[in-house]
């Protein structure tokens, strides 16, 4: 679809005569008839196949024709066509004299013709005007012409319809050849597909408007390149969605079981050495001078009561020193210079001579001990605490500090390892002498029944088109991660590309 435009510029008829040579009375009131038709080697009368147009009276005898296009007038003359411009044409321009106001062909005498010109040739679509001048014996006509496309038509023949748009069926303007030129941020044959945020993962991300990156299920992050780990995964990571690969020192289905209590919590004090001994279990090996489960208690060397025979102990930086009572000597006041005559036995102890009176021995009443019955009985000397418990004197009584796994006054009771319900997924717990054992239900295995074995939603290969299947362990369902070009919960649908333009 386009328009053949003809701009009449000047008509010269100096003598004011008709084609017959007869003069016009009072002058030649001139109007034009234009016939546009298909190319003819010799232009002949017949239908104006491309269109016709007539002007009103434009002047008398000789005159210049005003350009009237801006005011909506009739110059240039418009000859619209609704077909592909063929590139060739024939043009007939007739100048007529109008004796009266009726310009219809049937109202004019046949000899009212002033002049007739006929041209033919090639003409390409374009904005440039072709200037021409045709002269006869009595007249001269200067004019220019061109062919332009109608609005929204493009191409060499004005055959391509293109309407710029910016809605969800396309975001584009039209190029001179009628092809689409996508607006920034859009792509695709019809410019309806947004260009996602730069770096947005091709398979795991998509967008509904430019510079956006929306993540498919199982993926997260600005570029949708980070997998979402299994729901509840505590100290673990993933390389594909719904995984939970435990960080070092952690175990269990959700990586929430601490296998390295020593590193994560540093429970041992005062430079003690920590050893992991199971889940949330550890043992501290104390440096000399320290005691307690966590080596938190400073151990005085006098606590072991090394001084005998009533000697008093004094702590020193490099050990201890015994101050012996009269009649005793030695590192621990273990040597006596006394005999029974010196009444050396305290607290009602009875003295017995030895070695012909050179030495003695005290027989102590209950609750007292020592070579001179000078000490109350240390209730811990008999090691009353079982299972490695530590005995602590507390005045007239004593108490046992038990190792993990034991309880009772003397640490004689084995704490049930099953009390913490360590068996996952409904496993049955059995106490053993040195730990516990889990009997797992169908579908689970491992020391704590934490490993899912038989139920695998991906086992049936539900995903199509080489998609990757992930089992969601919390729901026994699967998630398909589609390769580029496929969508759907099983990646069963190809993302169709629109076919080419229909023309």
């Amino acid at each position: 679809s386009g328009v053949f435009q003809l701009q009449l510029q000047e008509f010269i008829n100096e003598r004011g005569v008709l084609a017959s040579g007869r003069p016009c009375e009072p002058g030649c009131r001139t109007f034009f008839r234009v016939c546009l038709k298909h190319f003819q080697a010799v232009v002949s009368p017949g239908p104006c196949t491309f269109g016709t147009v007539s002007t009103p009276v434009l002047g008398t005898n000789s005159f210049a024709v005003r350009d009237d296009s801006s005011g909506g007038g009739r110059n240039p003359l418009q000859l619209p066509f609704n077909f592909t411009w063929p590139g060739t044409f024939s043009l007939i321009i007739e100048a007529w004299h109008a004796p009266g106001d009726d310009l219809r062909p049937e109202a004019l005498p046949p000899d009212a013709l002033i002049s007739k010109i006929a041209i033919q040739g090639s003409l390409a679509v374009g904005q440039n005007w072709l200037l021409d001048e045709q002269t006869s014996t009595l007249t001269r006509l200067r004019y220019s012409y061109r062919v332009i496309c109608s609005d929204n038509y493009y191409g060499d023949n004005c055959s391509r319809l293109c309407k710029k748009r910016n809605d969800h069926f396309g975001h584009y303007v039209c190029q001179p050849d009628g092809n689409l030129s996508c607006l920034p941020g859009w792509t695709g044959e019809y410019c309806q597909q947004p260009i996602c945020l730069s770096g947005c993962h091709e398979q795991n991300g998509y967008c509904s408007k430019p510079a956006e990156c929306l993540c498919r299920p199982g993926w997260q992050g600005r570029l949708c390149n980070e997998c979402i780990p299994h729901n509840g995964c505590r100290h673990g990571t993933c390389s594909t969605p719904w995984q939970c690969t435990c960080d070092e020192g952690w175990g269990g289905l959700f990586c929430d079981q601490d296998l390295n209590y020593c590193t994560h919590h540093s429970p041992c004090k005062n430079g003690a050495t920590c050893s992991n001994s199971g889940q949330r279990s550890y043992t501290c090996t104390c440096r000399p001078g320290y005691t307690g489960v966590d080596c938190e208690l400073e151990l005085s060397e006098c606590d072991s009561n090394p001084c005998r025979n009533g000697g008093s102990c004094k702590d020193q930086e490099d050990g201890y020193h015994c101050l012996c009572p009269p009649g005793y000597y030695g590192l621990h006041c273990e040597h006596s210079t006394l005999s029974c005559a010196d009444s050396p036995c305290f607290n009602g102890g009875s003295c017995r001579e030895r070695n012909q009176g050179a030495n003695y021995a005290c027989e102590c009443p209950p609750n007292f001990t020592g070579s001179n019955c000078e000490k109350k009985v240390d209730r811990c000397t008999s090691n009353p605490c079982a299972n490695g418990g530590q005995c602590l004197n507390r005045g007239p009584s004593r108490m046992c500090r038990c190792r993990p796994g034991f309880t009772g006054t003397y640490c004689e009771l084995h704490v049930s390892d099953c009390a913490r319900n360590p068996c996952a997924h409904g496993g049955t717990c059995h106490d053993l002498e040195n730990g516990l054992m889990c009997t797992c239900p169908a579908g689970f295995s491992g020391r704590r029944c934490e490993v899912r074995t038989s139920i695998d939603a991906c086992a049936s290969s539900p995903c199509f088109n080489r998609a990757t299947c992930y089992t969601d362990l919390s729901t026994d369902t699967f998630v398909c991660n589609c390769p580029y070009g496929f969508v759907g919960s099983r990646c069963e649908f190809p993302v169709g590309l629109p076919p080419s333009f229909p023309w």
Partner: antibody, heavy 121, light 106 residues
């Protein structure tokens, strides 16, 4: 041959939410060449475009209904749905679902047979 | 909001030409589709992209669009062409239908 089929209740009480589903067969709802639209026609009146959706979930609504309309898509079921809240008697109409073709510059080449929804107490 | 105006009714004798107009501001800059709807039936696309016919639509249906007016022409109208006809265009992201024209074949 692509076919569209509307389904949902034929009677809805005023102030409640109208819910309809369109099931697409014979073609994938996930094609990049199509939008999936809802159009309605009150008895004896003309067609009114309600809104449409792309398989990615992008939605476009008629401004006059936007505050009450929600259109969603379920690619796994090859379905898309319409919800219209706070309905009144003026929402009584035959509701059509249709396929809008990008290549046809938005022309709707396939339509459902329509379902009459009456709003009445 | 954008409006498309159609004459409520057009009457035509069998074999004659029926022309239905659809007017809207700068409508020639938009792509126009035309739908035929017979009583109790769903609409059928008869013209898209101003003048193109989907497969299966008879050649007697033609379309044009320029300026502010699009026209659907039914040449050699047949009794089976009696129906309501709707024009449709897109204004930004909104679909807009004309009010509809009832074509009666006398």
């Amino acid at each position: 041959e692509v076919q569209l089929q509307e389904s949902g209740p034929g009677l809805v009480k005023p102030s409640e939410t109208l819910s309809l589903t369109c099931t697409v067969s014979g073609g994938s709802i996930s094609s990049s060449s199509y939008y999936w639209g809802w159009i309605r026609q009150p008895p004896g009146k003309g067609l009114e475009w309600i809104g449409d959706i792309y398989y990615t979930g992008s939605t476009y609504y008629n401004p006059s209904l936007k505050s009450r309309v929600t259109i969603s898509v379920d690619t796994s079921k090859n379905q898309f749905s319409l919800k219209l809240s706070s309905v009144t008697a003026a929402d009584t109409a035959v509701y059509y679902c249709a396929r809008e073709d990008v290549i046809l510059r938005g022309g709707s080449d396939y339509w459902g047979q329509g379902t009459l929804v009456t709003v009445s107490s | 909001s954008y409006e498309l105006t159609q004459p409520p009714s057009v009457s035509v004798s069998p074999g004659q030409t029926a022309s239905i107009t659809c007017s809207g501001e700068r409508l020639g800059d938009k792509y126009v589709s035309w739908y035929q709807q017979k009583p109790g039936q769903s609409p059928v696309l008869v013209i898209y992209e101003d003048f193109k016919r989907p497969s299966g639509i008879p050649e007697r249906f033609s379309g044009s669009n320029s300026g502010d007016t699009a026209t659907l022409t039914i040449s050699g109208t047949q009794p089976m062409d009696e129906a309501d006809y709707y024009c449709q265009a897109w204004d930004r992201d909104t679909g807009v239908f004309g009010y509809g024209t009832k074509v009666t074949v006398l």
